[in-house]
């Protein structure tokens, strides 16, 4: 990129710069038209026959460098050929000198600084590749010369350039000062700004375009050289923010439309709101869910919006005695998740009606909770209570949803309990062919004991068919027909309206060998 | 020697016509911009029109624009004025002017008058 | 576009300094012509480019131009210049050229 400094081409008003010194055949001004028929204005000389050692300067005003450390001049001119001349000397010359001159500010005067090399630098002796040829009577013809010099390195505010005649018939036709910059340029969607190099390379800090963050890495730089390019590298660059899609081959980012989303910053392009979602803004980095429906704290932000999972069905359970297996199905809606889980809920009715939530003395296997199979075992019921459970289905987003959990119930009453096991059987009496037996009254729950039942065989005899029962009502029996000097393995159950309890521990009993012994009690 | 010699004017009725000639001598008409320049009658002198060496480009003052037409005729070594729609307020004397010339780019001109004709006198009356 | 203003008059003593002024805006920006105009004849070119002075000029014609205003000056000035001056300058439109209402210098 060029940025112009001064352009005679462009200067509708007279360009009138310092002549020296101040005789005739000096640097004159004229005008003319251009080819787009605008007002240019040109300079000329033609001392062909001037004096030896004279010089023509010529000094343009003062240029403020704008920054620039080199500058370059570009010089259209024509020159006439000192053979179509007559009147030119052997001191007419096809050549003419560039100088320049830095200040700080306009302090340039008629006379000052000193019209000569050092102060004024010099950048080069021009020479023209195409002369113009005058032949009398007729027009002037030839090509227009264009020269390009490169001024510098500037360190002083601004400058003035001059042009040093000694002998020439010339027109400098327009001179064009500029200097290179390296134009403002967008890549990667990094933005690197306009730079004026003050070296072969600079490097050049960018910074994100609007909506972008600077991707990981070190920062993105550029070199911007001395000729106004910007070198070629690879740039790490930045990237388009959440909710933002890069656009315009790389140089922008473009808001998320609406119903899209990009969640993170870097590449990709916006994405169509997952399931259960919308946007209703531009710029999505997240799209909302619709109601009733959610995400996990877990859950990525582009994740499918899911909803609490339906109530498990057709639970079914099989008592037996103080266990319960209860076993379900899945169900039939999951909410569009995976993380599917169980949970029960428990209430507990006594024979009397009076309802509470499940105590402790019930005992959940796996769990009552955090269930991943579809059943459980549950223990420690109690003897004629009906149960309650609630089976509820679990996901990510239950606990976020509001309102009731659906839940699949099943009532389960257990049986009244029966008497406990008889203990402590004593043997009141003995002879060699009977055994009278007592023992305590078992505490039953549901009411009294109606009667008890007798269980007794040989010991040794272990067959069915040596086993004998008695059925008494009282806590007490008289086993007879019994072997003389032989041992019997005694049980006793009690049975009350809920059934028959379990038979106690067996209990060890022996019949005397002779009647001469007589009756004796033995306590077991 | 150089000279420019006016000629063409008089006596005319407001709204008509004139054309005023100028007849350049002893220097490169062709290499030359030419202008007219008018004097009313005890006034000041007033810049009329221009006219380029190859007579692609003219300028005129507002005050002329659309009613006076400049041009030359290189061949001849001579330059016109063509008045219309005259007023009275274009009284004057006419001069031919020539422009300082280039030492040999005739596309360009020195931005003052450095030759004069004698003029002519243009009388608008009825 | 600019106007340029002169006085109307100027009066100088034989052999005195006359100086006549020539203003408008931002004018020493422009190169000022100066031309002399004598009672029946055409004008003359006197001074052009500010300060130079034409072949068959006398010296004692000399001019400046800064700030908003050129000045002709004439130097131990002579009966024989007695005329009427004018200043020109380009207009900023293209290529048009504007005159200076003119200075009578009557030389006492």
């Known amino acids: 990129l060029e940025e112009t400094l001064l352009n005679t081409k462009l200067e509708t008003a007279d360009l009138k710069w310092v002549t020296f010194p101040q005789v005739d055949g000096q640097w004159e001004e004229l005008s003319g038209l251009d080819e787009e028929q605008h007002s240019v204005r040109t300079y000329e000389v033609c001392d062909v026959q001037r004096a030896p050692g004279q010089a023509h300067w010529l000094r343009t005003g003062w240029v403020p460098r704008r920054g620039a450390v080199h500058v370059y001049a570009t010089l259209r001119f024509t020159m006439l050929e000192c053979l179509s001349l007559p009147r030119a000397g052997r001191s007419c010359k096809e050549t003419f000198t560039v100088f320049y001159y830095e200040s700080d500010a306009d302090t340039a005067t008629a006379l000052t600084p000193a019209w000569m090399e050092n102060p004024y630098i010099k950048v080069d002796t021009v020479a023209a590749e195409h002369l113009t040829r005058k032949r009398p009577g007729a027009e002037a013809t030839g090509k227009v010369n264009v020269k390009t010099l490169r001024l510098g390195p500037l360190s002083k505010a601004g400058f003035y350039l001059a042009f040093q005649d000694q002998g020439a018939c010339m027109a400098l036709l327009s001179l064009h000062l500029f200097y290179k910059k390296c134009a403002q340029l967008t890549v990667n969607l990094t933005r690197f700004p306009e730079t004026v190099p003050r070296e072969l390379v600079v490097p050049v800090a960018g910074s994100c375009v609007v909506d972008a963050v600077p991707a990981p890495g070190p920062s993105p730089s550029l070199y911007c050289r001395e000729d106004g390019q910007w070198a070629e590298q690879p740039v790490t660059g930045c990237s388009c923010a959440p909710g933002f899609e890069a656009a315009e081959g790389n140089t922008k980012c473009r808001a998320c439309a609406q119903g899209t989303f990009k969640p993170l910053s870097g590449e990709g392009s916006c994405q169509p709101c997952p399931a259960n979602s919308h946007s209703n803004t531009i710029g999505s980095a997240v799209c909302q869910c619709r109601v009733g429906y959610f995400r996990a704290r877990t859950d990525p932000r582009g994740a499918p919006c899911t909803t609490p999972p339906s109530a498990p069905r057709s639970v079914v359970s099989r008592l037996n005695g103080s266990s319960l297996h209860l076993e379900w199905s899945a169900p039939l809606e999951s909410g569009g998740r995976e993380d599917l889980t169980y949970a029960l809920r428990c209430r507990e009715c006594r024979p009397g009606g009076s309802c509470a939530p499940c105590g402790g003395d019930l005992t959940f296997d796996p769990g009552p909770r955090d269930l991943v199979e579809p059943w459980v075992v549950v223990r420690g019921l109690r003897p004629d209570f009906t149960y309650t459970f609630e089976v509820t289905a679990l996901n990510g987003v239950s606990s976020l949803a509001t309102g009731p959990v659906p839940f699949e119930p099943v009532n389960v009453t257990t049986d009244r309990e029966v008497p406990p096991a008889v203990s402590d059987i004593r043997v009141t009496r003995s002879s060699p062919s009977s055994l009278s037996l007592a023992w305590a009254v078992p505490r039953a729950p549901s009411g009294a004991v109606l009667d008890y039942e007798v269980k007794y065989h040989e010991k040794g005899a272990e067959g069915p068919s040596s086993v004998r029962f008695l059925k008494t009502s009282e806590n007490r029996a008289e086993l007879r027909g019994l072997k003389r000097g032989a041992s019997y393995l005694v049980q006793v159950r009690a049975r009350s309206e809920a059934g028959y309890g379990p038979f106690g521990q067996e209990h060890h009993s022996q019949t005397q060998l002779d009647e001469s012994e007589g009756w004796r009690e033995q306590l077991a | 020697q150089v000279q420019l010699v006016e000629s063409g004017g008089g006596l005319v009725q407001p709204g008509g016509s004139l054309r005023l000639s100028c007849a350049a001598s002893?220097?490169?008409?062709?290499?030359?911009?030419m202008s007219w320049v008018r004097q009313a009658p005890g006034k000041g002198l007033e810049w009329v029109s221009n006219i380029n060496v190859q007579g692609d480009y003219t300028g005129y003052a507002d005050s002329v624009k659309g009613r006076f037409t400049i041009s030359r005729d290189n061949s001849k070594n001579t330059l016109y004025l063509q008045m219309n729609s005259l007023r009275a307020e274009d009284t004057a004397v006419y001069y031919c002017?020539?422009?300082?010339?280039?030492?040999?780019?005739?596309?360009?001109?020195?931005?003052?008058?450095?030759?004069w004709g004698q003029g002519t006198l243009v009388t608008v009356s009825s | 576009d600019i106007e340029l203003t002169q006085p109307p008059s100027v009066s100088v003593a034989p052999g005195q300094t006359a100086r006549i002024s020539c203003s408008g805006d931002n004018l020493g920006k422009k190169y000022v012509h100066w031309y002399q105009q004598k009672p029946g004849q055409a004008p003359v070119l006197v001074i052009y480019y500010d300060s130079k002075r034409p072949s068959g000029i006398p010296e004692r014609f000399s001019g400046s131009n800064s700030g908003n205003t050129a000045t002709l000056t004439i130097s131990g000035t002579q009966a024989e210049d007695e005329a009427d001056y004018y200043c020109?300058?380009?207009?900023?439109?293209?290529?048009?050229?504007?005159f200076g209402g003119g200075t009578k210098l009557t030389v006492l």
């Open positions: 002893g220097f490169t008409f062709n290499n030359a911009w």
């Open positions: 020109s300058a380009w207009t900023t439109t293209m290529m048009h050229i504007v």
């Open positions: 002017a020539r422009k300082g010339m280039s030492f040999y780019n005739n596309k360009y001109a020195k931005s003052m008058f450095d030759l």
